[in-house]
Interface confidence: medium
Amino acid sequence: VPRWRQQWSGPGTTKRFPETVLARCVKYTEIHPEMRHVDCQSVWDAFKGAFISKHPCNITEEDYQPLMKLGTQTVPCNKILLWSRIKDLAHQFTQVQRDMFTLEDTLLGYLADDLTWCGEFNTSKINYQSCPDWRKDCSNNPVSVFWKTVSRRFAEAACDVVHVMLNGSRSKIFDKNSTFGSVEVHNLQPEKVQTLEAWVIHGGREDSRDLCQDPTIKELESIISKRNIQFSCKNIYRPDKFLQCVKNPEDSSCTSEI
């Protein structure tokens, strides 16, 4: 008789999840000399231990502590780039501007980027059929708790000027319910962080509006100011030109506004 299995609303664990995590870990440690000593088998064991045999709606930050310990990494605290709803451009930027880091440029972020995972209560099986959806099922699921944990730690580590890339094409440029709005903003440390600088990325070619005046940006400014952190905002009217100028800052066309 087939065992009854909980059906969740979200997609199941990514195919070949264990192999993917292990392979990504090995690749990361090969590329980043300061992390080359990390034992990827131990990392996978700790990752697995955070959610295997546990109810996928009852995961806590505590479950991920062994993994957090193994993935401890020092990134320059004044070179942190946060992002919200514009991951691809943020990653393209740090691929060019090699001394800046998004969360996904760290070991733990790199391991989990774009992956889904969950287990089942009291069995050692990984659930490849379905996993809890944050809205429809529960917020304390393995994926959401993981990103909340690593995002909090990443924000807590930031210092001096912290940059955040925001998507100017969205109806809510700053969304209080995003990971940035609900976790990272509230975990920047005022005693370490002097300024949060928002880069609002424009989508349309002819869009010359000052999106820094958007009501949601003003809301972000208010939240940040109340936390005794200065706020500044810049419009990035031409993201393609922006990236090009990061690559070739000497280009004569890069002196004008981008």
């Epitope: 000399p33 080359r36 000593h37 990390v38 088998q41 310990k69």
Partner: antibody, heavy 119, light 110 residues
């Protein structure tokens, strides 16, 4: 063939300085992680410092601020500048290549050069 | 002082199997890979085991390594007289930001 040859050891007074050299052949020092490891008479191995292919350097607490690791890519040579030497620094000093990649053990060692700090 | 602890000495007769332990903490062995080095009398160390359990070419399969939690061990089966040497475990330590070697184990073949 792949080998490392240390030189520059000798007798030095406490408070003095010495510069050790490690000449590499068969591979480039700039493309690998290069370590210095020492062994005091009758004692075990003690890691001293490392220089990464990217140029980052790390040191054991016991030598931090006194020793400096560097390299000359044109000479394919690794150096260890040792200042403010004390009797505790008396040891055989080895340079060792740490293979760059997931396989990262120190797979090539020099024969060692002896440093004696004594008045 | 070393932060990786090994037995001071070990011994065995030819053909026997001998195991050398190496005990550390979560900041070194717990999260990082372990290497083992052999040092024959009067010579430089030689890499014996890397990444917990892998052998470089030229190292006989009589030598094997393993790791569990914050401890590691080196096993030598079919002991031979030429195995008489000092053996050191080593790992990177995240807290110290540097390598740590074990205290070393002197292996005697009786």
């Amino acid at each position: 063939q792949v080998q490392l040859v240390e030189s520059g050891g000798g007798l030095v007074q406490p408070g003095g300085s010495l510069r050790l050299s490690c000449a590499a052949s068969g591979f480039t020092v700039s493309g690998n992680y290069m370590n210095w490891v020492r062994q005091a008479p009758g004692k075990g191995l003690e890691w001293v410092s490392v220089i990464y292919s990217g140029g980052d350097t790390y040191y054991a607490d016991s030598v931090k601020g006194r020793f400096t690791v560097s390299r000359d890519n044109s000479k394919n040579t690794l150096y260890l500048q040792m200042n403010s030497l004390t009797a505790e620094d008396t040891a055989v000093y080895y340079c060792a290549r740490e293979y760059s990649g997931y396989y990262y053990g120190m797979d090539v060692w020099g024969q060692g050069t002896t440093v004696t700090v004594s008045s | 002082q070393s932060v990786l602890t090994q037995p001071h000495s070990a011994s065995g007769t030819p053909g026997q199997r001998v195991t050398i332990s190496c005990s550390g903490s979560s900041s070194n062995i717990g999260g990082n890979t372990v290497n083992w080095y052999q040092q024959l009398p009067g010579t430089a160390p030689r890499l014996l085991i890397y990444t917990n359990n892998k052998r470089p070419s030229g190292v006989p399969d009589r030598f094997s390594g393993s790791k569990s939690g914050t401890s590691a061990s080196l096993a030598i089966s079919g002991l031979q007289s030429e195995d008489e040497a000092d053996y050191y475990c080593a790992a990177w330590d995240n807290s110290l930001k540097g390598y740590v070697f074990g205290t070393g184990t002197k292996l005697t073949v009786l």
